[in-house]
């Protein structure tokens, strides 16, 4: 009877070790799986469009990272109280987990589009560079559903990469004409977005608090109307001291207006950036290492 | 040299509406960062914003006479026009064109930096 | 009634100084910078400092703009008898009251 119940235990630690086997081998295959699914897709800058199937709904990137899903590309989401699925670019570099939601890298986008567009989102979404504006309304549906961070990637035409980075960034409602609202800074590009870089000019730089507006729809401090003159949907004030959906410059620029794609705290205002990546994870992220 | 001159009738029946028209020589209307504007002064009184309006058709109006005021552009006649309805005595003014231009960036700021020479419209029967 | 008030008058003699206010309130000057107009008799007005301070190209340095609170002022110094005319302060007042103007102040000089 003992040699009985012994070789139970035997036959079940086995067991055991062979389901932990199993799932490192699911798990392979799944990665394996994708990995040559997207070198399938990936050839050049052809799509990268990444189907899970309905295996699960994901409420950002972080938790397709999470779930296993290693490689960079467009997967659907559904944050908390979106009505409906969408496509995001989730980058899974960078630490991983990534949510983008906006790209500039070409100018092959046009920014200067009205309240609607802003809102529900347009742009390329299916190429890996391509560019897009997520939608205001899914902005919020995101970072309302956890506190994230927010990481804008800069480039310039020089080949010098800079980055700035926020917690605790939240888009408002509707009502609220999707109200930006950012938390601490830190990165090498410098405080554009809360206009810290000098205490006199935040009252008209920072972009802190400050309502979304477009062409028709004008919602900043200034007496004429920024987006139309900046031909951009932005957070303006009056009008800004960063515009990342400005108009697609190969860097020094002369303009009427500082319409171009504008980090001032790096390039100052008559420089348009070549790329540019803003993306959110959550503050508390924590890469789920297999 | 930019230049702006007004155009329309001097004489205007009350509870008619006011017609002017302003031509710009010397630069395209449709140049961005520019809102070309309408302004009047009563006879020996001081100035009076009416409103402005982009080269795209976005338009602005002062708020006391949103009602009665509409203001166009024909870009491809380089022009812009004022329309008042409803006019009274009260409305007896010289009326000026004006271009209002952004003047800085840090923080942006506007103002009327062309005028045109004026045209005195009298409301009267 | 204009929301921006000015002196309607002014003087001064050849060589002197003069100041001319313009007084407003939190949510036109005090939030907002200030532009001044000239108008010589019988002309259209002309921009004579914008931003608060700046003058624009061809404009004298014997014109200088300042503000404090909801209060700006223009200060001709040097007076000179081609600068008898009347001056306008005008400012943005938000989008409930749009552009305004002061009611003018007459200079005249002595």
């Known amino acids: 009877l003992e040699d009985c119940a012994q070789e139970q235990m035997r036959l079940r630690a086995q067991v055991r070790l062979l389901e932990t086997r199993v799932k490192q081998q699911q798990v392979k295959i799944k990665q394996l799986l994708q990995e040559n699914e997207v070198q399938f897709l990936d050839k050049g800058d052809e799509n990268t469009v990444i189907d899970l199937g309905s295996k699960r709904q994901y409420a950002d990137c972080s938790e397709i990272f999470n779930d296993g899903y290693k490689l960079s590309g467009f997967y659907k989401i559904k944050p908390l109280q979106s009505p409906a699925e969408f496509s995001v670019y989730c980058d899974m570099s960078d630490g991983g987990g990534w949510t983008v939601i906006q790209r500039r890298s070409d100018g092959s986008e046009n920014f200067n589009r009205g309240w609607k567009d802003y809102e529900n989102g347009f742009g390329n979404f299916v190429q890996k560079h391509g560019e897009y504006w997520l939608g205001n309304k899914n902005l919020h549906f995101l970072t309302t559903q956890e506190d994230y961070t927010l990481k804008i990637d800069l480039a310039d035409f020089e080949k010098n990469s800079r980055y700035a980075q926020y917690k605790n960034f939240k888009v408002g409602d509707e009502k609220n004409f999707y109200e930006l609202n950012i938390g601490e800074y830190s990165g090498t590009a410098g405080d554009s977005l809360a206009g810290n870089f000098h205490p006199e000019v935040q009252w008209w730089a920072s972009h802190q608090r400050m309502k979304f507006s477009t062409w028709d729809r004008d919602h900043d401090n200034y007496e004429g109307n920024c987006a139309e003159e900046d031909q951009s949907g932005w957070w303006f004030n009056r009008c800004h001291s960063a515009n990342l959906n400005g108009v697609y410059y190969s860097g020094p620029y002369t303009a009427k207006t500082d319409n171009g794609i504008v980090w001032y705290t790096w390039h100052g205002w008559w420089y348009s950036l070549k790329s540019v990546v803003m993306k959110i994870r959550p503050n508390d992220f924590i890469p789920n290492v297999i | 040299q930019v230049q702006l001159q007004e155009s329309g009738p001097g004489l205007v029946k009350p509870s008619q509406t006011l017609s002017l028209t302003c031509t710009v020589s010397?630069?395209?209307?449709?140049?961005?960062?520019?809102?070309w504007s309408w302004i009047r002064q009563h006879p020996g009184k001081g100035l009076e914003w009416i409103g402005y309006i982009y080269y795209s058709g976005s338009t602005y109006y002062n708020p006391s006479l949103k009602s009665r005021v509409t203001i166009s552009v024909d870009t491809s006649k380089n022009q812009f026009s004022l329309k008042l309805s409803s006019v009274t005595a009260a409305d007896t003014a010289v009326y000026y064109c004006a271009r209002d231009s952004v003047m800085g960036y840090a923080p942006r700021v506007r103002a009327f930096d062309i005028w045109g020479q004026g045209t005195m419209v009298t409301v009267s029967s | 009634q204009s929301a921006l008030t000015q002196p309607p008058s002014a003087s001064g003699t050849p060589g002197q100084r003069v100041t001319i206010s313009c007084s407003g309130s939190?949510?036109?000057?005090?939030?907002?910078?200030v532009n001044w107009y000239q108008q010589l008799p019988g002309t259209a007005p002309k921009l004579l400092i914008y931003?608060?301070?700046q003058r624009p190209s061809g404009v004298p340095d014997r014109f200088s703009g300042s503000k404090s609170g909801t209060s700006a002022s223009l200060a001709i110094s040097g007076l000179q008898s081609e600068d008898e005319a009347d001056y306008y302060c005008s400012s943005w007042a938000g989008d409930l009251n749009g552009r305004l103007f002061g009611g003018g102040t007459k200079l005249t000089v002595l």
């Open positions: 010397g630069g395209s209307i449709s140049s961005g960062g520019y809102y």
């Open positions: 939190s949510s036109n000057i005090g939030t907002n910078t």
């Open positions: 931003s608060t301070n």
